[in-house]
């Protein structure tokens, strides 16, 4: 099985009440603008076939995609939460920059690609949906990486 290295975040990253609240507020605000309730991006399907030890690496991929292709392109929306949450998530991404998997990660990339394809297919409403699931991203990062 692939071995993951440096795929850890200190639990203190997830114990800051202010930024946790802002992340959840941003997700709530965006989910109010999300009219596509049939589709879920971060759920059981995302983790299908991925072992517990590989989940932080998977969530790193999801986090980087969310930052680069969702949050930065929508960075002038959802005041005043966006401008606080994005730098926080960017710091987490930076801390996971050395998180790698030694060996085959094709099964992980396949799952992440499905999420990316769903967001792309939905266009701007897919981006809004991804922002609306930042609470799930936050919780999944916490569960997988601490």
């Amino acid at each position: 099985a692939p071995i993951s290295s440096h795929c850890r975040l200190d639990k203190s990253n997830f114990q800051q009440p202010y930024i946790t609240n802002r992340t959840f507020m941003l997700a709530k605000e965006a989910s109010l603008a999300d009219n596509n309730t049939d589709v879920r991006l971060i759920g059981e399907k995302l983790f299908h076939g991925v072992s517990m030890s590989e989940r932080c690496y998977l969530m790193k991929q999801v986090l980087n995609f969310t930052l680069e292709e969702v949050l930065f392109p929508q960075s002038d929306r959802f005041q005043p939460y966006m401008q606080e949450v994005v730098p926080f998530l960017a710091r987490l991404s930076n801390r996971l920059s050395t998180c790698h998997i030694e060996g085959d990660d094709l099964h992980i990339q396949r799952n992440v690609q499905k999420l990316k394809d769903t967001v792309k297919k939905l266009g701007e409403s897919g981006e809004i949906k991804a922002i609306g699931e930042l609470d799930l991203l936050f919780m999944s990062l916490r569960n997988a990486c601490i």
Epitope: E69, F72, Q74, R77, Q79, P80, M82
Partner: antibody, heavy 118, light 111 residues
């Protein structure tokens, strides 16, 4: 030091399409954390937002101009452009390009005056 | 979408201080804003960003005489030790609903 420089036609006839381009130097338009915007200002009047784009193509417009405005990006040339169709004298303005950093405009071009007249 | 209200004009003597106000509309009192200066015949220049806690991030090369603060829905720009080159129009800007808005601007005259 990032610099923005607008270039435009100077004069456009009514009902025609106005095109202005913004060239970026000292930085990359492919900076993932920035958005690139167009703002205009009729002579002796206030500022009006037109729209913005991310280098990946995500774009949004001022609702009042959405039907006539189109913003595009050319990463190879490190440029972004605005076209405004069916112009009238009311579109006579200084057109400014700008950089957005987490919503705030933090860099402006020097502006280019476009006059709509026959 | 938010609306920004600015008074049309303000004046103060050379060397004095002046405080400009930008008021956010109801429901948007926790929004960040940016302040921009436009000297006569020139393009706008970014001065600073001000959040609802009053902290501000200034643009490159902006003198220490310029500072930002906040109270409720009001965002302030204070220019201390006013210089002749500070005579200009000052605009506030905000965003957040998929579009951006500007205040109508305050014309500052140095007496």
């Amino acid at each position: 030091q990032v610099q923005l420089h607008e270039s435009g036609p100077g004069l456009v006839k009514p009902s025609e399409t106005l095109s202005v381009t913004c060239s970026l130097s000292g930085g990359s338009i492919s900076s993932s954390s920035h958005l690139w915007a167009w703002i205009r200002q009729p002579p002796e009047k206030g500022l009006e937002y037109i729209g913005r784009i991310h280098y990946r193509g995500s774009v949004s417009y001022n609702p009042s101009l959405k039907s006539r405005a189109a913003i595009s990006v050319d990463t190879a040339k490190n440029q972004f452009s605005l076209t405004l169709s069916a112009v009238t004298a009311a579109d006579t303005s200084f057109y400014y390009c700008a950089r957005l950093d987490m919503g705030a405009i933090d860099k402006w071009g020097q502006g280019t005056l476009v006059i709509v007249s026959s | 979408q938010p609306v920004l209200t600015q008074s049309p004009s303000a004046s103060a003597s050379l060397g004095a201080s002046i405080k400009l106000t930008c008021t956010l509309s109801s429901g948007h009192s926790n929004y960040d804003i940016a302040w921009h200066q436009q000297q006569s015949g020139k393009g706008p220049r970014f001065l600073m960003r001000v959040n609802n806690g009053g902290s501000h991030n200034k643009g490159d090369g902006i003198p220490d005489r310029f500072s930002g603060s906040s109270s409720g829905a009001e965002r302030y720009l204070t220019i201390s030790s006013l210089q002749s080159e500070d005579e200009a129009d000052y605009y506030c800007q905000t965003w957040g609903t998929g579009t951006h808005v500007f205040g109508t601007g305050t014309k500052v005259t140095v007496l």
